[in-house]
Amino acid sequence: EDELQVIQPEKSVSVAAGESATLRCAMTSLIPVGPIMWFRGAGAGRELIYNQKEGHFPRVTTVSELTKRNNLDFSISISNITPADAGTYYCVKFRKGSPDDVEFKSGAGTELSVRAKPS
């Protein structure tokens, strides 16, 4: 039970088109060392949404940057949501490796659904 766990407290989130969606994720430990990544979908075809270590993700803001929450919080906010953003999002912890980081543990996922923009 001391082993790191990845917690996504919302099983599902519904957001209106054009708004921002916050997807929450926390770790129970900083060990093992390694980055956090967010994906949409699972398996080989999953889409990288955010990589803590590298990359440019213009629509994604880490919540900790906004609120100075503690360093176990890896929640993200995705701006200007469209119906194409619907899907299940996974917060995934990687273990630092050489040459490549190795997936260590995934959260249970948060299903994002998109409502029509209120008239």
Epitope: E1, I7, V13, N70
Partner: antibody, heavy 120, light 106 residues
């Protein structure tokens, strides 16, 4: 100081809808999630769902999916919970409750409760 | 959904007694657990969060422990104002409350 003030008691007929409000004050409204929890007479607490007042995103307990709608009005720092297709089993006290700060996903301040009675 | 089972459902005790309430989760929830106190006709009040952290303003006679699936709320020396119903709540996946434990006067 943090305050959550809810609307008054309601009596509704089966099949009708009810909309309960919760006005927040004493803190930055958009910085804290809000939950709704209900309690039937003599029973325990039942979590209904959550709303992020910042973007308006919502997450509902499976039991209430399709029947509950949570909304917010940032101009008045008010959240709303609407429950439709009411039945007698929905008779309960409905509470709004603010989620704590900083990844503390617990309920640190509660409204006074709103009694909703469903009776023909 | 994660189920939370509290025991006992009620306990009779006297002022000064040590009271222990347990809460079991249907799956591991790490330390993502809170305890609330509710008095008749009032809203619940947060006592303990993150399994063992005391909420500001709560007397130190209240303590929480546990991790994984088994958790405990202890009142070290019961006071007259402590007679109430206590609920556990998980925050690991959505939210779920336990069924409650009523602490009554013996």
């Amino acid at each position: 100081q943090v305050q959550l003030v809810q609307s008054g008691a309601e009596v509704k007929k089966p099949g009708a809808s009810v909309k309960v409000s919760c006005k927040a004050s004493g803190y930055t409204f958009t910085s804290y999630y809000m939950h709704w929890v209900r309690q039937a007479p003599g029973q325990g607490l039942e979590w209904m769902g959550i709303i992020n007042p910042s973007g308006g995103s919502t997450s509902y307990a499976q039991k209430f999916q399709g029947r509950v709608t949570m909304t917010r009005d940032t101009s008045t720092s008010t959240v709303y919970m609407e429950l439709s297709s009411l039945r007698s089993e929905d008779t309960a006290v409905y509470y709004c409750a603010r989620e704590g700060p900083e990844q503390l996903w617990y309920l640190d301040y509660w409204g006074q409760g709103t009694l909703v009675t469903v009776s023909s | 959904d994660i189920q939370m089972t509290q025991s006992p459902s009620s306990v009779s005790a006297s002022v000064g007694d040590r009271v222990t309430i347990t809460c079991r989760a249907s799956q591991g929830i790490s330390s993502w657990l809170a305890w609330y106190q509710q008095k008749p006709g009032k809203a619940p009040k947060l006592l303990i969060y993150a399994a063992s952290s005391l909420q500001s303003g709560v007397p130190s006679r209240f303590s929480g422990s546990g991790s994984g699936t088994d958790f405990t709320l202890t009142i070290s020396s019961l006071q007259p104002e402590d007679f109430a119903t206590y609920y556990c709540q998980q925050a690991f996946s959505h939210r779920t409350f336990g069924g409650g434990t009523k602490v009554e006067i013996k």
